[in-house]
């Protein structure tokens, strides 16, 4: 019989196990209409061709219908995320039908066999939908399939096989192994529904990627670059959950997609926004915080259908837990000159002061070298809503490129402790808020004193709105 094993190390082994050890099971897919928010409630099982359970269980033909599709299982039981998602859907859409697709017997297999079963399960869902379409008032446009991991590809098959087009499929970290690079008919793809949105939370460019890396929807959202999720590092896991195993880290990151979706349902007033970008590095540089031409969108349930979009990669940063929303800022800092810099690479730190709150001291992540006499762009994000920005405090430190230079700097400092020596000249900082799309320019508080040495601080105050230069107009932007 199937036995538990950790998802990453052992999954790699699973892909190469002989077929002989698979378990013989009765092929079965069940549809459980969750009629109560109480997770213990047994719900109602729908049966193809039998209309009575639909009436007995109060299936609402005119309402939205959600099908939740789980993935591969090591234990053969429903995981804890399931009832969290059911409850969140019931909370958000009180009249909706929430159906759990139970394909546990076919998912509680070797991973390779579970993959081979996805087509059969997708077909079963399509047949159920075809039957429901025969009923008065039932519309396929009101159907939203939500698939986690392997379940995302099951949803793809269902959307492909059904007569007509389902309204929406949400892929929650669709499974990677055996699907990466696969033909569009053998994985989730934009053709499978009127709108296919995808959250990618466990992708790896080296090693085994549990989640699929390639874009497979109309919009593909990569929170935190789609790889390392905050609160899921080994240290976080050791601290907060006392687990400390790689398995738990994998589970935390893979399952984060579900929690981001749940967050979008229950924290409607705190929507997270993602921004279109060609790649994660450009996003980390703060280049991609535009909402023009539908370049930004809410994530999860609140995502807006983008017309003519296909495989649009979008990025955002998040907090480590619910509510996941953060506030993104693009910072443009023009470094006018270096003085006595040697081989020192500066690291900037900013503290933002706003009408609502002040941020912590935030490091500006350096994706590429800091350029002299050039405008350098950074991405900064805060966990709290600062309100309107009023002022910025900037400091910097130097990270030496070699031990020799470090010794040289130390010797110089010890011989002339009051002569800072190294200086940067920064006169203004331009800031753009991702969430409000507002652009502000901050000027040095003392225009005569714009040089800053390591460990010292420079203050900038708002000097004007926008970044307009001569003959330049700034379009007004509406967030979706």
């Amino acid at each position: 019989s199937p036995t538990p094993f950790g998802p990453e190390g052992q999954l790699a082994d699973e892909l190469h196990k002989p077929k002989a050890i698979q378990t013989e099971v009765k092929p079965s897919v069940r549809f459980n209409l969750r009629t109560s928010k109480d997770p213990e409630h047994e719900g109602c099982y729908l049966s193809l061709g039998h209309s009575q359970p639909l009436e007995d269980c109060g299936f609402n033909m005119t309402a939205k219908t959600f099908f939740i599709i789980h993935g591969w299982t090591m234990s053969g039981i429903f995981e804890n995320w399931l009832h969290k998602l059911v409850s969140a859907l019931h909370t958000r859409e009180k009249d909706a039908n929430v159906v759990v697709v139970d394909w546990l017997p076919l998912a509680h297999q070797l991973y390779t066999d579970a993959v081979n079963n996805t087509r059969v399960v997708g077909h079963s869902i399509a047949r159920m939908l075809d039957w429901l379409q025969e009923k008065d008032d039932f519309s396929l446009g009101n159907v939203h399939l939500i698939g986690y991991s392997l379940g995302a590809h099951v949803a793809g098959y269902a959307g492909n096989f059904v007569k007509g087009t389902v309204g929406r499929i949400t892929g929650l970290d669709p499974a990677g192994p055996m699907f990466e690079g696969a033909d569009i008919h053998k994985r989730l793809s934009p053709d499978d529904a009127d709108f296919v949105d995808v959250l990618h939370t466990y992708t790896r460019s080296f090693g085994l990627s549990i989640g699929i890396q390639m874009p497979v929807g109309h919009i593909d959202i990569y929170p935190n670059g789609g790889d390392f999720q905050p609160g899921c590092g080994l240290n976080d896991v050791l601290g907060s959950m006392a687990y400390g195993t790689i398995t738990e880290v994998v589970k935390c990151e893979h399952e984060r997609a579900v929690h981001l979706f749940v967050d979008s349902l229950v924290n409607q007033d705190k929507p997270s926004f993602a921004f279109q970008c060609t790649d994660s590095n450009r996003f980390k540089k703060g280049i991609c915080l535009s909402c023009r031409k539908n370049r930004c969108n809410s994530i999860g349930y609140n995502a807006k259908k983008m017309r003519n979009k296909r495989n649009s990669k979008m990025y955002l940063k998040t907090r480590a837990g619910m509510p996941f929303r953060v506030y993104h800022y693009q910072m443009k800092i023009h470094v006018f000159s270096y003085k006595n810099m040697g081989e020192i690479e500066p690291t900037f730190y900013v503290t933002l002061y706003g009408t609502n709150a002040d941020s912590q001291t935030l490091p500006l992540e350096i994706v590429e070298r800091i350029e002299q006499n050039a405008t350098n762009t950074f991405l900064v994000y805060t966990e709290e809503d600062l309100g309107d920005l009023l002022k910025i405090q900037l400091t910097w430190e130097g990270a030496s490129q070699s031990w020799y230079n470090l010794w040289k700097e130390l010797r110089s400092y010890l011989s002339q402790p009051h002569n800072p020596g190294r200086e940067l000249n920064i006169r203004r900082i331009r800031v753009k808020s991702g969430e409000t799309q507002r652009k502000l320019t901050f000027c040095a508080e003392d225009p005569e004193n714009t040089s800053i040495s390591p460990g010292r601080e420079l203050w900038f105050r708002k000097c004007r709105d926008g970044w307009r230069m001569k003959n330049e107009t700034s379009p007004t932007v509406e967030l979706p």
Partner: antibody
Framework: QIQLVQSGPELKKPGETVKISCKAS????????MNWVKQAPGKGLKWMGW????????TYTDDFKGRFAFSLETSASTAFLQINNLKNEDTATYFC?????????????WGQGTTLTVSS | DIVLTQSPASLAVSLGQRATISCKAS??????????MHWYQQKPGQPPKLLIY???NLESGIPARFSGSGSGTDFTLNIHPVEEEDAATYYC??????????FGGGTKLEIK
Amino acid sequence: QIQLVQSGPELKKPGETVKISCKASGYTFTNYGMNWVKQAPGKGLKWMGWINTYSGVPTYTDDFKGRFAFSLETSASTAFLQINNLKNEDTATYFCARFSYYGRHYFDYWGQGTTLTVSS
Amino acid sequence: DIVLTQSPASLAVSLGQRATISCKASQSVDYDGDSYMHWYQQKPGQPPKLLIYAASNLESGIPARFSGSGSGTDFTLNIHPVEEEDAATYYCQQTNDDPPWTFGGGTKLEIK
């Protein structure tokens, strides 16, 4: 009302086989998983594993792999625990207990227990 | 596997007083705000009976003198005021996600 009724006490010799039954009533049998729990004399509770009552797929904990088998007779709403090649250390009371597939997996209803004595 | 350690192994409490039983888990049994820790009562010759589920929820039909609390790795079952019929062995159990699910070693409560 919901009930789980187990078969009566068993006295067996080492090397023999025993099959304990657990008949469910008052609810839809296939809508809840069935657990098996062992309690040796004067000892605590030890979870042996469970069986999916719809698919018939059993899951065993490491200590109960090999000689132990969970099975079903769905039409009779009955779950079975079979122990082969009995050993003295199998002497215990065995309980069946149901749990909800969808919730937090606690065991809300239990059978009265079947006492198995293995002695030569 | 998650190991549950109950303490004390046994305790004697006077009628009407408070009985407090502790259960410590080797790992957190919390998941997204819920604690997957449950408490059972077992009297001699009887099967266990569910008292508290998800750390603090009282099972229907169980008297309100039973209460559960805790999160993460530390959980407590309180009985107040203790009655004669509460003499039994009490077990904690965790069912956090992937099996194996485990029971604590039990605490025997005697009424003085």
